[in-house]
């Protein structure tokens, strides 16, 4: 990155940069006198000029480094202030396009699929279909749904062998958690809307929600992308 770009990004005045002390600004009469003196002076001049060049070079490097670290600090500060409202201690970040909801990252699909395909899609994203712990989490998730006529698959379907609603992590539904509208029967999967929880046929093509559990991110400034 050139110096001008650095100044521009930091909004520094351009006259405060390293250009203000250049070799051409040394007084000319320093290098005049008798032959011996001239030799000595020329040697001294050469040394001084060399010294000035070295000092100038160092000051340019140091200024550049200071400004570079300022830019990086700005970026960090912006990033940290952006995340401050949603983060818990430990700098937790959701990948780009994922929405943070407490200790989870949620991805709301834009396309439609049957339940099985939705399950597979989440797997390819190293995530799972949404698992809802309690009514409170359900309500917070529903608040993120923008229209009443959108249904989303979650990770809950009817287990025929156990004749019960089963989460994809193997646990069974606590009947107090979700009030399901519709039948509990073979080939039934659960969808949520802005207001309700529905049993739908698993072959129905609707949208779906993937989730990732948040974990602390160490030695990292930016969110995963």
């Amino acid at each position: 990155m050139d110096q001008q770009a650095i100044y521009a990004e930091l909004n520094l005045p351009t006259d405060s940069g390293p250009e203000s002390s250049s070799p051409s600004s040394l007084p000319r009469d320093v290098c005049q006198g008798s032959p011996w003196h001239q030799f000595a002076l020329k040697l001294s001049c050469a040394g001084i000029i060399l010294l000035v060049l070295v000092v100038t070079g160092l000051s340019v490097s140091v200024t550049s480094l200071i400004q570079k670290s300022s830019i990086e600090k700005c970026s960090v500060d912006i990033q940290q202030s952006r995340n401050k409202t949603t983060e818990r201690p430990g700098l937790l970040n959701c990948p780009i396009y994922w929405q943070q909801l407490r200790e989870k990252c949620l991805l709301f699909s834009h396309t439609v699929n049957p339940w099985n395909n939705s399950l597979a899609d989440c797997s390819t994203k190293e995530s799972s279909l949404l698992l809802i712990r309690d009514k409170d989490e359900l309500i917070h998730t529903q608040n993120l749904i923008r229209d009443k006529a959108i249904l989303f698959w979650i990770g809950l379907n009817f287990s025929l062998s156990e004749k019960n609603w089963k989460w994809i992590n193997g646990s069974f539904l606590n009947s107090n958690d979700l009030e399901i509208r519709g039948d509990a029967k073979e080939n039934s999967c659960i969808s949520i809307s802005q207001t309700s929880v529905y049993s739908e046929y698993c072959s129905t093509e609707i949208r779906w929600i993937c989730q990732k559990e948040l974990t602390p991110v160490r030695n990292k400034v930016y969110p995963d992308s």
């Epitope: 396309t111 229209d147 009443k148 006529a149 249904l151 509208r181 529905y198 046929y201 129905t204």
Partner: antibody, heavy 119, light 107 residues
Framework: EVQLVESGGGLVQPGGSLRLSCAAS????????MSWVRQAPGKGLEWVST????????YYADSVKGRFTISRDNSRNTLYLQMNSLRAEDTAVYYC????????????WGQGTLVTVSS | DIQMTQSPSSPSASVGDRVTITCRAS??????LNWYQQKPGKAPKLLIY???SLLSGVPSRFSGSGSGTDFTLTISSLQPEDFATYYC?????????FGQGTKVEIK
């Protein structure tokens, strides 16, 4: 090939009731949301109502809310629209169509049935 | 409610012409837009969904583009069977709304 066939239209007086039916064939009926869309004579298309595949969720246009009821019988592959308190402005050709949950469009349509509300 | 406005309302064209119909939404609808064709006395037929995806079996002379608020349906070379009324429809939010229609007539 998916086929949708509407029936039940006709002439009815203002304030009267009518029940439309739509018989579906050629696909797994219960796996699809279904909708009713109407078209007044010489006018454009207007979405009326949608029901999810299981019948659990229903949605209505404000102009028919409280007067019309959408329902389905998946064992009979049939969609219904119960229309009560009919008004002159409800006069239209009523189409049943497959789809209607966001973001899906209506990929199959019936031929339509005409409902005329007049005294 | 999201209003959908189509233009022109009734263009005249000849066989072989390139026809462009525009549809404008009153707010951003991303790519949640469909195009339908309707012939007199018949049910509408879905041509394009998600703004630019051609439904299987629809001739390739039909194409759609746009996102946000401005969309276009283009018929690259008008055929006799294309004289019909075309409707855009948003599926971004309920109520699902249609444009007022564009009737493509023979010049």
């Amino acid at each position: 090939e998916v086929q949708l066939v509407e029936s039940g239209g006709g002439l009815v007086q203002p304030g009267g009731s009518l029940r439309l039916s739509c018989a579906a064939s050629g696909s797994t009926f219960s796996s699809y949301a279904m909708s009713w869309v109407r078209q007044a004579p010489g006018k454009g298309l207007e979405w009326v109502s949608t029901i999810s595949g299981s019948g659990g969720s229903t949605y209505y246009a404000d102009s028919v809310k409280g007067r019309f009821t959408i329902s389905r019988d998946n064992s009979r592959n049939t969609l219904y629209l119960q229309m009560n308190s009919l008004r002159a402005e409800d006069t239209a050709v009523y189409y049943c169509a497959r789809g209607g949950l966001i973001p899906s469009g209506f990929d199959y349509w019936g031929q339509g049935t005409l409902v005329t509300v007049s005294s | 409610d999201i209003q959908m406005t189509q233009s022109p309302s009734s263009p005249s064209a000849s066989v072989g012409d390139r026809v462009t119909i525009t549809c404008r939404a009153s707010q951003s609808i991303s790519s949640y837009l469909n195009w339908y064709q309707q012939k007199p006395g018949k049910a509408p037929k879905l041509l394009i969904y998600a703004a630019s995806s051609l439904l299987s079996g629809v001739p390739s002379r039909f194409s759609g583009s746009g996102s946000g608020t401005d969309f276009t349906l283009t018929i690259s070379s008008l055929q006799p069977e294309d004289f019909a009324t075309y409707y855009c429809q948003q599926t971004y939010s309920t109520p699902l709304t249609f444009g007022q229609g564009t009737k493509v007539e023979i010049k």
